[in-house]
C-alpha cells in the first residue's frame, strides 16, 4: 500500500516584538520531537502592527486591543486550531518602555497591564508581558543569528548555507539597532571584559561563551535624532534651525514640547523663548556626521578601552551580524553588499544627504514622508556610530554583514527569546539518535 | 536584589559644602532615575529633585535649585548630591531613592550636622 | 506646587481595630487614568517604606491589611486589623508634577 503521511507533529510559538515605534508578531514553527536539535526552529510569519509603538499608548490604553487584534487574528489564521491552547503566547517590550518606565513606573505598567488583558483575550498559551532589560536584547538577538546561522552546531558542515557564513565555528557578534536604544554583543578574544555590568557567561550544547554586551538606551536611531535637534536648538536657541542631516528645501516645524519630552534630550533641555521652531535642511553629510559625533562622549574612559560615554568596550573580533535598522536603513540605500566598502559607503551618503527634497520625494514617490526625510539621518548616523562609537575600521568594515533574515527568520532578539523561554537551547549537546524519527510509515 | 547604599555621617561648619553618595546595586543603574530627599526633624520630607543616570540630566525643586547639584558616575554605579552654603536649617537626614514616579527603594540616610 | 495636606497629624489605635488616615491634595494627581499617590510608613532610624503605590497597589511584600483608596483630590490609607508592628510615622506623596510633595505625616501608635 502506498505511504500516508501522517498528521505533522509540530510546535508553534508566537513572540511580539513590542519596540519603541512599532509592534512585529512572529511565528516560529519547529518539529516535535527535534527541540533540541539546533538550526530546527523557524519563522513562519511575521506580522507587524498597524500603528505606533506600544508606549504611545499611555493616554488611550482603551485602543491597545483593537491595535493587536488584526496580528492576532492572523496568527489564530496561521496556526492550526487543534494547537492554538499549547502555543505560548510572549511580549517583550524594549527601549521605548524602559523610557516610559524611566519616567512613571505606574504608565508603564499600565500600558502593560492592558497588553496582557488584551493577549489573555485569545485562545492561546499567554506567557505574560514584561520590559525586557537591555542586556537580554542583546544577548537573544546574539543567540539568534548565531543559532540559525548554525553555529551552535557541532557538526561541521562541508557547506554553507548562507553566503556570508564562514564554515568555521566562530560566533558571529550582534549589532541590533533600533529607535530607542542600540545593542552591541560579540566574544572577545582572550580579553576579560573589565566591566560586570557587560559580560555574560552561556553553556550552549556543551560548549561555554563569555559574551560582552552593551545596550545604549537613547542612542537607537529615533532618540538619537532627538537628542541631535535637542543639542543643536540649546547652541542656536532660534526658532529656525538650519539642519546638515537633511536634504536642501526639506522643512519641518518641531513642538518644544514634544522635544523634550523623552529623557533622552534631558541633559540638552532649557527654557526656550518659543514653543515650535522650523529644521530647515541643507543636506551636508560631513557637518552631520560632526554633528552627531557630539553625542558620544569620548573624553572619558575608566577602563582600558570605551565606547562612548565611558563604556568599556573590547576589541572588535570576528564577523558581525547588523540587523534591524541597520540593515533597513542600509538596505533602503542601497549599501548591504558585502563588496561596498566604507569608503564607498560614505561616498554614497554624500551624495544622498546633498540631493534636493524634492527630487528625492520625486525618486521615492511610494515611501512615506516622515520615514523618507530621515535616511539621511539614519545613514550618517549608522556610519557615525559604527566607525566613532564602536571603532570599525575601514578594514574591519568588511566584516560587517547588513543582515535581514537568515534561512527565512529574521534577524533580531525574538527568536533568541522564545528558544530560551521554551528551554529548546540545552547547555549540554543532545546525544543524537541513530535514526531520526520518520514522518511517512 | 536592588540596594542603596549611602555615604557615612557628616558634620560640617556654616557656609560649608557636603557631598555625599548613592551606590547602587541590583539593577541597570541607567534605567532608572535616582531622587535624593531631605527630611528634617524626624518629620517633614521634603523632595529635591532627581539625575538621570542615563546622560546626567536633572530637575530640582526650586527652592534647592542653584545650592544642589546631582552628578552620577555610571561606571561605579554611584549617585552623588553635592549641598552648599550650608546653614544650621540644612542639618538633616539625606535619602537616595530610585524611581520614575515611584519611590519603591531608599538608601538608609546620610545624616548631615551643620554645626559651628 | 501640589500641597498635600494629611489628617490627622496623629492617631491611637485599638489593636484588631481600624486606622483610616487620610491625604487631601489642592489639585488633582490623577493623569492618563493613574492616580499618582502613595504611601509610605517609616519606623526610627529607617528611611520610608513604601506602602502603596498609584493610589491603590500594594508595594512589594506588604500586608493585606494596609489598604489605599481614592481618586482625584482625595486619598486615604486604611490598616485593618492594627498590629503592634504597624506603629510609625505614615505620610503620602504626590509625583504628578514637579516638585513632588509629601503629606505632613500622621503619627500612629497603640491605644
Known amino acids: 500500500t502506498q505511504n500516508k503521511a501522517l498528521p505533522e507533529n509540530v510546535k508553534y510559538g508566537i513572540v511580539l516584538d513590542a519596540g519603541s515605534s512599532h509592534t512585529s508578531l512572529y511565528i516560529y514553527k519547529w518539529p516535535a520531537e527535534k527541540e533540541n536539535d539546533t538550526g530546527v526552529v523557524h519563522q513562519v510569519e511575521e506580522c507587524r502592527v498597524k500603528g505606533p509603538g506600544i508606549s504611545k499608548f499611555v493616554q488611550k490604553v482603551n485602543e491597545i486591543g483593537i491595535y493587536l487584534t488584526d496580528c492576532m487574528e492572523r496568527a489564530r489564521e496561521v496556526i492550526p486550531r487543534s494547537q492554538h491552547q499549547e502555543t505560548p503566547v510572549y511580549l517583550g517590550a524594549t527601549a521605548g518602555m524602559r523610557l516610559l518606565r524611566m519616567e512613571s513606573e505606574e504608565l508603564a505598567d499600565r500600558v502593560l497591564d492592558v497588553v496582557e488583558r488584551s493577549l489573555s483575550n485569545y485562545p492561546f498559551d499567554f506567557q505574560g508581558a514584561r520590559i525586557i532589560t537591555g542586556q537580554e536584547e542583546g544577548a537573544y538577538g546574539w543567540i539568534t543569528i548565531n543559532y540559525l546561522l548554525g553555529k551552535f552546531s557541532q557538526k561541521t558542515r562541508w557547506f554553507s548555507i548562507v553566503p556570508y557564513e564562514t564554515n568555521n565555528q566562530e560566533t558571529f557578534g550582534a549589532l541590533d539597532l533600533g529607535g530607542a536604544s542600540t545593542q552591541v554583543t560579540f566574544v572577545p578574544q582572550n580579553q576579560t571584559i573589565e566591566s560586570p555590568d557587560n559580560a555574560l557567561q552561556f553553556r550552549l550544547y556543551g560548549k561555554d561563551y563569555n559574551v560582552y554586551t552593551h545596550s545604549f538606551l537613547c542612542y537607537g536611531k529615533d532618540q538619537a535624532l532627538w537628542q541631535k535637534l535637542a543639542k543643536d536648538i540649546q547652541v542656536s536657541s532660534a526658532e529656525s534651525l538650519a539642519d546638515p542631516c537633511f536634504h536642501p528645501g526639506y522643512k519641518k516645524v518641531v513642538n518644544v514640547s514634544d522635544l523634550y519630552k523623552t529623557p533622552c534630550t534631558k541633559r540638552f533641555e532649557m527654557t526656550l523663548p518659543f514653543q515650535q521652531f522650523e529644521i530647515q535642511g541643507i543636506g551636508n553629510y560631513q557637518q552631520c556626521h560632526q554633528s552627531i559625533l557630539e553625542l558620544f562622549n569620548t573624553s572619558y574612559c575608566p577602563y582600558s578601552q570605551c565606547a562612548f560615554n565611558g563604556i568599556f568596550l573590547p576589541p572588535l573580533q570576528g564577523d558581525f551580524g547588523a540587523f534591524s535598522a541597520f540593515y533597513f536603513v542600509m538596505k533602503f540605500l542601497n549599501l548591504t553588499s558585502e563588496k561596498v566598502s566604507q569608503e564607498k559607503v560614505t561616498e554614497m551618503m554624500k551624495k544622498f544627504c546633498a540631493q534636493p527634497w524634492e527630487e528625492i520625494k520625486t525618486s521615492y514617490a511610494g515611501v512615506k514622508e516622515k520615514y523618507l526625510s530621515e535616511y539621511c539621518f539614519s545613514g550618517t548616523y549608522i556610519l557615525s556610530l559604527l566607525l566613532q562609537g564602536y571603532h570599525f575600521t575601514a578594514d574591519s568594515w568588511e566584516h560587517i554583514h547588513f543582515i535581514g533574515k537568515i534561512q527565512g527568520s529574521d534577524a533580531g532578539w525574538t527568536l533568541g527569546y522564545m528558544l530560551n523561554l521554551t528551554n529548546m537551547i540545552p547547555a549540554e549537546q543532545p546525544l543524537s539518535t541513530p535514526l531520526s524519527h520518520s514522518t511517512y510509515v | 536584589e536592588v540596594q542603596l547604599q549611602q555615604s557615612g555621617p557628616e558634620l560640617v561648619k556654616p557656609g560649608a559644602s557636603v557631598k555625599m553618595s548613592c551606590k547602587a546595586s541590583g539593577y541597570t543603574f541607567t534605567d532608572y532615575n535616582m531622587h535624593w530627599v531631605k527630611q528634617s526633624h524626624g518629620r517633614t520630607l521634603e523632595w529635591i529633585g532627581y539625575i538621570v543616570p542615563l546622560n546626567g540630566g536633572s530637575t530640582f525643586n526650586q527652592k534647592f535649585k542653584g545650592r544642589a547639584t546631582l552628578t552620577v558616575n555610571t561606571s561605579s554605579r554611584t549617585a552623588y548630591m553635592e549641598l552648599r552654603s550650608l546653614t544650621s536649617e540644612d542639618s538633616a537626614a539625606y535619602y537616595c531613592?530610585?524611581?520614575?514616579?515611584?519611590?519603591?527603594?531608599w538608601g538608609q540616610g546620610t545624616l548631615v550636622t551643620v554645626s559651628a | 506646587d501640589i500641597v498635600l495636606t494629611q489628617s490627622p497629624a496623629s492617631l491611637a489605635v485599638s489593636l484588631g481595630q481600624r486606622a483610616t488616615i487620610s491625604c487631601r491634595a489642592s489639585e488633582s494627581v490623577d493623569n492618563f487614568g493613574v492616580s499618582f499617590m502613595y504611601w509610605f510608613q517609616q519606623k526610627p532610624g529607617q528611611p520610608p517604606n513604601l506602602l502603596i503605590y498609584g493610589a491603590s497597589n500594594q508595594g512589594s511584600g506588604v500586608p493585606a491589611r494596609f489598604r489605599g483608596s481614592g481618586s482625584g483630590t482625595d486619598f486615604s490609607l486604611n490598616i485593618h486589623p492594627m498590629e503592634a508592628d504597624d506603629t510609625a510615622m505614615y505620610f503620602c506623596?504626590?509625583?504628578?508634577?514637579?516638585?513632588?510633595?509629601f503629606g505632613g505625616g500622621t503619627k500612629l501608635e497603640i491605644k
Open positions: 531613592a530610585r524611581g520614575g514616579t515611584r519611590f519603591a527603594y
Open positions: 506623596q504626590q509625583t504628578k508634577e514637579v516638585p513632588y510633595t
